[in-house]
Interface confidence: low
């Protein structure tokens, strides 16, 4: 399904990288990591260098919004999280810099990074109700919620 | 070269149990995936259980789920499949495959074993 | 889980013949799809990864395509040395499937 209508004509401008390489662990303790070329997963990890990092990238939305929009990149490369539709993986995707404008289609970069406590939640911009998500016996995903787990630990300092 | 031989087959009773091994050789078998992959009789391929690289993920078909135990020793380069409650469907030949470095479970699998038959005396 | 079909269950053909098979997966499945070769008393060879990627050391004869739910493998000259059991798996889902296979005979 395509974005949301309403939020084509919002236009995000990249401000900063706010986080360097940081690990995700799910509500069960596992780890997201490269499942292969295109996908992540989630896996628990004796040993965390297995485990992604990522770095996060601020955007500042030309309409007044008070949520932290943000890009999800891996650290050291050029991979981008991207949403696809619900219960579809995400999509690590290959751009030669950070996008300096997001507008449109191109949403699908972006996620709303929401905190509660130590639980973080990162929110499709394109899919407003879908969470970025690890599902038992499948890929990062996007999913609205339960089974899919929605909320994740923030590791960093990690190296 | 990859070498992946299992053991363990034989004659059992339904309702009993079984333990198969895999040993590996010819690579780093502590960063690979592995898989156990039946087939009875004149019948096609079913998958049975995967491990991931370092033995903390496992993965069970619903045939089989509660009944068999997937574990790995990396020490030893050997894969185990330890099989209670035996069924009469469980008679297969039961072969050991490899799938891609480290931690992919969904993987096509470029090296197998021979196999090794279970059967049920009556 | 995600279910695998394949067709037809045998195919009759010639040494020279086009071989076509095809294999429909219950649920869309990107390009997760590999396709095996299993001769009687052997165990399965792996022909194809990721839909149309040939394995290493196998002949171009042998080509796959599709995505999605709807694929196919293709033997474009069948040889002696093909008639087999053909069988598809979906690497897709952690739960691997298999498709029932094809078994290509001398008609």
């Known amino acids: 399904s395509a974005p949301f209508s309403f939020l084509s004509n919002v236009k995000y401008n990249f401000m900063r990288i706010i986080k360097y390489e940081f690990i995700l662990n799910d509500a069960l303790n596992q780890s997201i990591i490269r499942a292969n070329d295109q996908y992540l997963t989630a896996a628990a990890l004796h040993n965390l260098d297995e485990a992604v990092k990522f770095d996060m990238g601020a955007y500042k939305s030309s309409k007044d919004d008070a949520k932290i929009t943000v890009i999800l990149r891996i650290s050291k490369t050029q991979l981008y999280v991207t949403a696809q539709d619900e219960d579809q993986p995400v999509l690590l995707k290959e751009m030669p810099e950070i996008p300096k404008t997001i507008t449109g289609s191109e949403t699908n970069l972006l996620f709303f990074w929401e905190t509660h406590g130590t639980k973080n939640y990162f929110t499709s911009v394109a899919h407003p109700n879908l969470f970025i998500a690890t599902k038992q016996d499948y890929w990062v995903c996007l999913a609205g919620g339960p089974p899919s787990i929605t909320d994740f630990q923030i590791l960093e300092n990690q190296a | 070269q990859v070498q992946l031989v299992e053991s363990g087959g034989g004659v059992v009773q339904p309702g009993r149990s079984l333990r198969l091994s895999c040993t590996a050789s010819g690579f780093t078998f502590s960063m690979f995936g592995v898989h156990w992959v039946r087939q009875a009789p004149g019948k096609g391929l079913e998958w049975v259980a995967a491990v991931s690289y370092d033995g903390s993920n496992k993965y069970y078909a619903e045939s089989v789920k509660g009944r068999f135990t997937i574990s790995r020793d990396n020490s030893k380069n050997i894969l185990f499949l330890q099989m209670d409650s035996l069924r009469l469907e469980d008679t297969a030949v039961y072969y050991c495959?490899?799938?891609?470095?480290?931690?992919?479970?969904?993987?096509?699998?470029?090296?197998w074993g021979q196999g090794t038959l279970v059967t049920f005396s009556s | 889980d995600i279910q695998m079909t394949q067709s037809p269950s045998s195919v009759s053909a010639s040494v020279g013949d086009r071989v076509t098979i095809t294999c429909r997966a219950s649920q869309g499945i990107s390009s997760w799809l590999a396709w095996y070769q299993q001769k009687p008393g052997k165990a399965p060879k792996l022909l194809i990864y990721e839909a149309s990627n040939l394995e290493t050391g196998v002949p171009s004869r042998f080509s796959g395509s599709g995505s999605g739910s709807d694929f196919t493998l293709t033997i474009s000259s069948l040889q002696p040395e093909d008639f087999a059991t053909y069988y598809c798996?979906?690497?897709?889902?952690?739960?691997?499937?298999f498709g029932g296979g094809t078994k290509v005979e001398h008609k």
């Open positions: 798996q979906q690497t897709s889902s952690f739960l691997l499937s």
């Open positions: 495959a490899r799938g891609r470095p480290k931690v992919v479970i969904p993987a096509p699998l470029a090296h």
